[in-house]
């Protein structure tokens, strides 16, 4: 109704179900893991299932090793199609030491920022892929405990490949990235016998990302 | 704001264990934002890491003395605790307390322990 | 373990001078996981530095600090009377934690 009491046609926004999340995956790009194209593989699979948008979802990737990169924050693209091409070009940083609490950690302070594109009210998902102990393992409690604070849901790949390949126990390896994963653990935690089986999970990573839209 | 203060004997026998408390008062043990450490200080020395506790009770440990070392927390009562056992001379020193995050943002003011018979 | 060695190991410097301490590890450090402190005779330490360049709060802009890798300084721009002291770097990103030998400032 108009201020002078006449009818007016009037519409309210169409309703629609959330399709927004804002995902930073966290990419472990240490010498150890080998090779780097199963991993831009994996990402063009993942992300190729995506609705990438403005106002769906938005992806950001970080890389660490030694060191941390911001390959791209999450507002720098603006299409399924565009992260892909950015994704394909992603090179491996290399890093004797597997920094996986700097990693998870700098994603949680600077990639989740409003000025990297991240939106307040909108679902923060946290994909993290290593091959390895990490080197600051140790700080891992304190990393873990802030993205929980943060609401971040975390899903943890461990690539048992480098392990395999030296024959070595997977035991210490596995309980830590467990330890990473949001509860419940197996729905949150993937572990693949090496580089080359990451497109394994694709689907089932997928469906279960999505599946917090809801 | 958060503060920190250690207890415990000042003089202990060698071969015996050294026990000292840091109670924190300003802020609760529990928040799970930080670790709790402690560092000790030789006499005109620089500075060796312990290890240090999270609420949780996960403990990290400096392999030098590990065997030596027991870090616990009582969270009811915003408590840490260090047991360092078989003391000897070597373990003279002023211990500290300390809080965690990004580098130990909050120390507490030390206390010396003199191992001695 | 990382070991951490400062140098000089004592710096004789004037008031209103300027102060560059040197602190070099065996083994490469990330920067997010270097800290600088300052402890003065008969005191706990106090964080400086933390990301081996950001400044703890109430630390005055006259502490900076630079460096990556091995190679870390603290430079401090104008010496004032309070910060005659010791200055230790310490790294946390691999256990054991551990603390450079320290450099002591002290009036020239």
């Known amino acids: 109704v108009s201020p002078t009491f006449q009818v007016v046609n009037s519409f309210a926004p169409v309703q629609e179900c959330s399709t927004q999340l804002d995902i930073v995956i966290v990419l472990d790009g240490s010498n150890s893991i080998y090779p780097w194209d199963s991993v831009t593989a994996f990402l063009n699979d993942l992300l190729e299932r995506m609705d990438i948008g403005p106002k769906q979802t938005q992806v950001g990737i970080v890389q660490y090793g030694e060191n941390v990169t911001h390959e791209f924050n999450l507002n720098k693209y603006s299409s399924t199609e565009e992260v892909l091409v950015a994704a394909k070009k992603i090179v491996q940083r290399g890093g004797r030491q597997t920094m996986t609490a700097l990693g998870i950690d700098t994603a949680r302070k600077e990639a989740f920022t409003e000025a990297r594109g991240a939106r307040r009210g909108v679902k923060k998902v946290m994909v993290i892929v290593t091959d390895g102990e990490s080197h600051d393992n140790h700080r891992l409690k304190k990393v873990i405990q802030d993205c929980e604070d943060e609401n971040i849901q975390r899903f943890s790949i461990a690539i048992l490949g480098s392990y395999n390949r030296g024959n070595l126990s997977t035991e210490k390896f596995v309980e830590e990235i467990k330890s990473i994963a949001s509860e419940p653990t197996e729905k949150h935690f993937f572990n693949v016998s090496d580089e080359l089986a990451l497109v394994t999970i694709v689907k089932t990573l997928g469906e279960r990302i999505f599946a917090l839209e809801a | 704001q958060v503060q920190l203060q250690e207890s415990g004997p000042g003089l202990v026998k060698p071969s015996q264990t050294l026990s000292l408390t840091c109670t924190v008062s300003g802020g609760s043990i529990s928040r799970g934002n930080y670790y709790w450490s402690w560092i000790r200080q030789h006499p005109g020395k620089g500075l060796e890491w312990i290890g240090y506790i999270f609420y949780s009770g996960s403990t990290y440990y400096n392999p030098s003395l590990k065997s030596r070392v027991t870090i616990s927390v009582d969270t009811s009562k915003n408590q840490f605790s260090l047991k360092l056992s078989s003391v000897t001379a070597a373990d003279t020193a002023v211990y500290y307390c300390?809080?965690?995050?990004?580098?130990?943002?909050?120390w507490g003011q030390g206390t010396t322990v003199t191992v001695s018979s | 373990e990382i070991v951490l060695t400062q140098s000089p190991g004592t710096l004789s410097l004037s008031p209103g001078e300027r102060a560059t301490l040197s602190c070099r590890a065996s083994?490469?450090?990330?920067?997010?996981?270097l800290v600088w402190y300052q402890q003065k005779p008969g005191q706990a330490p106090r964080l400086l530095l933390y990301?081996?360049?950001s400044r703890a709060t109430g630390i005055p802009d006259r502490f900076s600090g630079s460096g990556s890798g091995t190679d870390f300084t603290l430079t401090i721009s104008r010496l004032e009377p309070e910060d005659f002291a010791v200055y230790y770097c310490q790294q946390y990103g691999n256990s054991p934690l551990t603390f450079g030998g320290g450099t002591k400032v002290e009036i020239k």
């Open positions: 300390a809080r965690d995050g990004y580098g130990m943002d909050v």
């Open positions: 083994q490469s450090v990330s920067s997010s996981y």
């Open positions: 990301d081996a360049s």
